[in-house]
Interface confidence: low
C-alpha cells in the first residue's frame, strides 16, 4: 500500500516578511518523526502520531518547503511552493524639463524599485488620470518610458506614474502605488524678436517712454522682461493681453551716459531669450543762454550781448554766427534811445546723428534816457474856436516813462493831454508842456489862440 504525506497549505501566497503556519500529516500507521526541510526560519509548534505543525517566520522570498517521513523503512515526501508578494519600495517619476516647448517631444521616465512577483507588476504612466502608457515591470529596478508631444493644454498638467501589483487571481486584490505628481510647464516663444519702440535721441535729464512688445507668447504672464538703457536697467511695467506681452518704461538719460547708447529689450521664457536693440544717442543741449553785460543800460554806454550754449552747439546771435561750434557769439553796441526795448535773438543748432536740433532764446535791452516831447506830434501853435471840443495831441517819451503836464504860464491852470476837452476863451494863452522823470525835464512851449465865437 502506498501512503501519502500532505503539506498544508498548498502553494500559499503571503506578504514579504510574514509568517506561515505549516502542517505536515501522513496516513502511514507506523511513521517515524516528520521532518520539515526549508531554508527559512522554522519552529516546531506541535506534533502527534502522523502529524507535525511548524511556524515559518520572516518569509522574504519565494521558497519551496519539503516534508519527509520514514514509513516502513522507506521515505515519503510532500511539498508546497510559497509565493511571496512585495509592494514596490519606490515609484518615482523622473523630473520633467523646467520648460517644454510646445510641439516638441519630451520623455516621461518612471523608475520602480522592488515589487514582486514581477509577472504580476505593471507600470502605468498618466497625464491627469489619462493613461499614456502601460508596460510590464521587467528589470530591477524597472524603468518605463513614454514619449509625449507637448501641447498648450499640457501647461500645468500633472504627470504621474502608477504601479499595479495584481494579486487578484490569488484572491488578494489589486495593490496600487502612485508616485508624487510632477507638473509640466509648456511654452511658446516666437523666433521673431520683440518690437522695440524707442526714441532715436534722448536729451540728458529728460524722460521718454520706451515700449517693447512681443506677440505669440505663451504663457505670456510667465515671461521675464529686461529693459535697459546702456547698463542702466529700466523699471518696466509689464502688461499681458492674451498671447501679447507689452513692457513700458520711462528712459531717463543721465549725464554720464552721453553718446551712442543702446536700448535693449530682452524677453525670456522657458530659458530662451528674444532680444531687440535700438541705437539711441544721448545728448546734452545746454542753452542757448543770452546775456547782457547790463540788462538796463544808460544812454551812450557800451553794451555787450553774448550768447553761449554747450559743447558742439553752433550759436547765431541776431544773424551773426559764432566762430565755431561750442564758441559764444558776441556783439557790442552803443546804447541809444532807439535800442530801448530792443530784443536780441539767439538761435542754437546741435547736430545729433545727422539731424539738426534747434533752440532759440532772446533777451530784451532796456536803455535809460531822459524825457523828450516829440515836436512832430505836439503842435506849438494851436488855433481853436471857442466852445469846441479838441485834444491836445502831445506825446512824451523816455525811460523811465515821463509824466507830461501842460500848465498855463502865470497860473496853475492845467489842460489835459491826450484827452478831449471843451475849449473856451479862458484857455487862450501860452502853456509850458513839461515832460519829467527821474532822468530830468524837457519843456515845450505851446500857444493856444482861441477865437471867440461870433455873437448873434
Amino acid at each position: 500500500q502506498e501512503f501519502l504525506l500532505r503539506v498544508e497549505p498548498q502553494n500559499p501566497v503571503l506578504s514579504a516578511g510574514g509568517s506561515l503556519f505549516v502542517n505536515c500529516s501522513t496516513d502511514c500507521p507506523s511513521s517515524e518523526k516528520i521532518a520539515l526541510e526549508t531554508s527559512l526560519s522554522k519552529e516546531l509548534v506541535a506534533s502527534g502520531m502522523g502529524w507535525a505543525a511548524f511556524n515559518l517566520s520572516n518569509v522574504t522570498g519565494n521558497s519551496r518547503i519539503l516534508c519527509s517521513v520514514y514509513c516502513n523503512g522507506s521515505q515519503i515526501t510532500g511539498s508546497s511552493n510559497i509565493t511571496v508578494y512585495r509592494l514596490p519600495e519606490r515609484v518615482e517619476l523622473a523630473p520633467l524639463p523646467p520648460w517644454q516647448p510646445v510641439g516638441q517631444n519630451f520623455t516621461l521616465r518612471c523608475q520602480v524599485e522592488d515589487g514582486s512577483p514581477r509577472t504580476s507588476l505593471t507600470v502605468v504612466l498618466l497625464r491627469w488620470e489619462e493613461e499614456l502608457s502601460r508596460q510590464p515591470a521587467v528589470e530591477e529596478p524597472a524603468e518605463v518610458t513614454a514619449t509625449v508631444l507637448a501641447s498648450r493644454d499640457d501647461h500645468g498638467a500633472p504627470f504621474s506614474c502608477r504601479t499595479e501589483l495584481d494579486m487578484q487571481p490569488q484572491g488578494l486584490g489589486l495593490f496600487v502605488n502612485t508616485s508624487a505628481p510632477r507638473q509640466l510647464r509648456t511654452f511658446v516663444l516666437p523666433v521673431t524678436p520683440p518690437r522695440l519702440v524707442a526714441p532715436r535721441f534722448l536729451e540728458v535729464e529728460t524722460s521718454w517712454p520706451v515700449d517693447c512688445t512681443l506677440d505669440g507668447l505663451f504663457p505670456a504672464s510667465e515671461a521675464q522682461v529686461y529693459l535697459a538703457l546702456g547698463d542702466q536697467m529700466l523699471n518696466a511695467t509689464v502688461m499681458n493681453h492674451g498671447d501679447t506681452l507689452t513692457a513700458t518704461a520711462t528712459a531717463t538719460a543721465r549725464a554720464d551716459q552721453e553718446g551712442a547708447r543702446e536700448i535693449v529689450c530682452n524677453v525670456t521664457l522657458g530659458g530662451e531669450r528674444r532680444e531687440a536693440r535700438e541705437n539711441l544717442t544721448v545728448f546734452s543741449f545746454l542753452g542757448p543762454i543770452v546775456n547782457l553785460s547790463e540788462p538796463t543800460a544808460h544812454e551812450g554806454s557800451t553794451v555787450t550781448v553774448s550768447c553761449m550754449a554747450g559743447a558742439r552747439v553752433q550759436v547765431t546771435l541776431d544773424g551773426v554766427p559764432a566762430a565755431a561750434p561750442g564758441q559764444p557769439a558776441q556783439l557790442q553796441l552803443n546804447a541809444t534811445e532807439s535800442d530801448d526795448g530792443r530784443s536780441f535773438f539767439c538761435s542754437a543748432t546741435l547736430e545729433v546723428d545727422g539731424e539738426f536740433l534747434h533752440r532759440n532764446s532772446s533777451v530784451q535791452l532796456r536803455v535809460l534816457y531822459g524825457p523828450k516831447i516829440d515836436r512832430a506830434t505836439c503842435p506849438q501853435h494851436l488855433k481853436w474856436k471857442d466852445k469846441t471840443r479838441h485834444v491836445l495831441q502831445c506825446q512824451a517819451r523816455g525811460n523811465p516813462y515821463p509824466e507830461l503836464r501842460c500848465l498855463k504860464e502865470g497860473s496853475s491852470r492845467e489842460v489835459p493831454v491826450g484827452i478831449p476837452f471843451f475849449v473856451n476863451v479862458t484857455h487862450n494863452g501860452t502853456y509850458q508842456c513839461q515832460a519829467s522823470s527821474s532822468r530830468g525835464k524837457y519843456t515845450l512851449v505851446v500857444v493856444m489862440d482861441i477865437e471867440a465865437g461870433s455873437s448873434h
Epitope: D231, R254, A255, D256
Partner: antibody
Framework: EIQLQQTGPELVKPGASVKISCKAS????????ILWVKQSHGKGLEWIGK????????TYNLKFKGKATLTVDKSSSTAHMQLNSLTSEDSAVYYC????????????WGQGTSVTVSS | DAVMTQTPLSLPVSLGDQASISCRSS???????????LHWYLQKPGQSPQLLIY????RFSGVPDRFGSGSGSGTDFTLKLSRVEAEDLGVYFC?????????FGGGTKLEIK
Amino acid sequence: EIQLQQTGPELVKPGASVKISCKASGYSFTDCIILWVKQSHGKGLEWIGKINPYFGTTTYNLKFKGKATLTVDKSSSTAHMQLNSLTSEDSAVYYCARKEAYPDAMDYWGQGTSVTVSS
Amino acid sequence: DAVMTQTPLSLPVSLGDQASISCRSSQSLVHSNGDTYLHWYLQKPGQSPQLLIYKVSNRFSGVPDRFGSGSGSGTDFTLKLSRVEAEDLGVYFCSQSTHVPYTFGGGTKLEIK
C-alpha cells in the same frame, strides 16, 4: 552662494603691465555689473570703473582712463582688469565687486588682489 | 567729483555703546529720478568691504538690525549703531553712486576705548 574669487598677489616691475581676474559664481554673471575699486594707504578707496558683462559696455573714472582696461569673458564668468605702465603709485589692493541694477550698491566684493610695483 | 567727507576719523567706543558716524557730500546726492544713492560699507580688519546700508536707509540682507538707522538727505547723512558688538569693529565708509565717478569717504575707524 554668491562669490567673487580674485587671482593672487602680483609683484611687477615699473613700466610693466598686469592683468588681474575676478571669477563670479552663485549667480547669473550677465545679470549684474562688475566694478573695480583701488585701495591704497594714502588715498583710501577709489572707484576705477565698471563693466556690464552682458553688453561689454564700460564706464571709467577719468583718473584711470588709459591706466585700466576692463574686459569680461562670459563663457567663464570672469572679469579682467589690465593695468598698464605701472609705477609705485599703482601699488595697492584692487577689489572687484558686483552691483545689481537695484539696490545700485556694491553688494558682494572679491577678496582683493595685492599689486606691488617694485624694481 | 562729489567729495565725501566723514567725521570723526576715529571713534573709540565701549561695547554696548551707541555710535554715530557722519558723512557730508560736496554736492547733492539726489538723482534726477528722485532716489539718493548714498551707501555705507564696513571693512573689518584684513577683509574686503561689505555692504551694510544702501540708498541712505535700507539694510542689506543679513545685516543685523542694530545697524538700524541710516538717515539724511541731500548732502548730509548719518549712520547710527544702537549697541556696538566686537564684530562691528573696523573702518566704516560712506559712498555715493549718484554721480560718475562714484566716490568714497575717507573712512571712520570704530575701535574699543
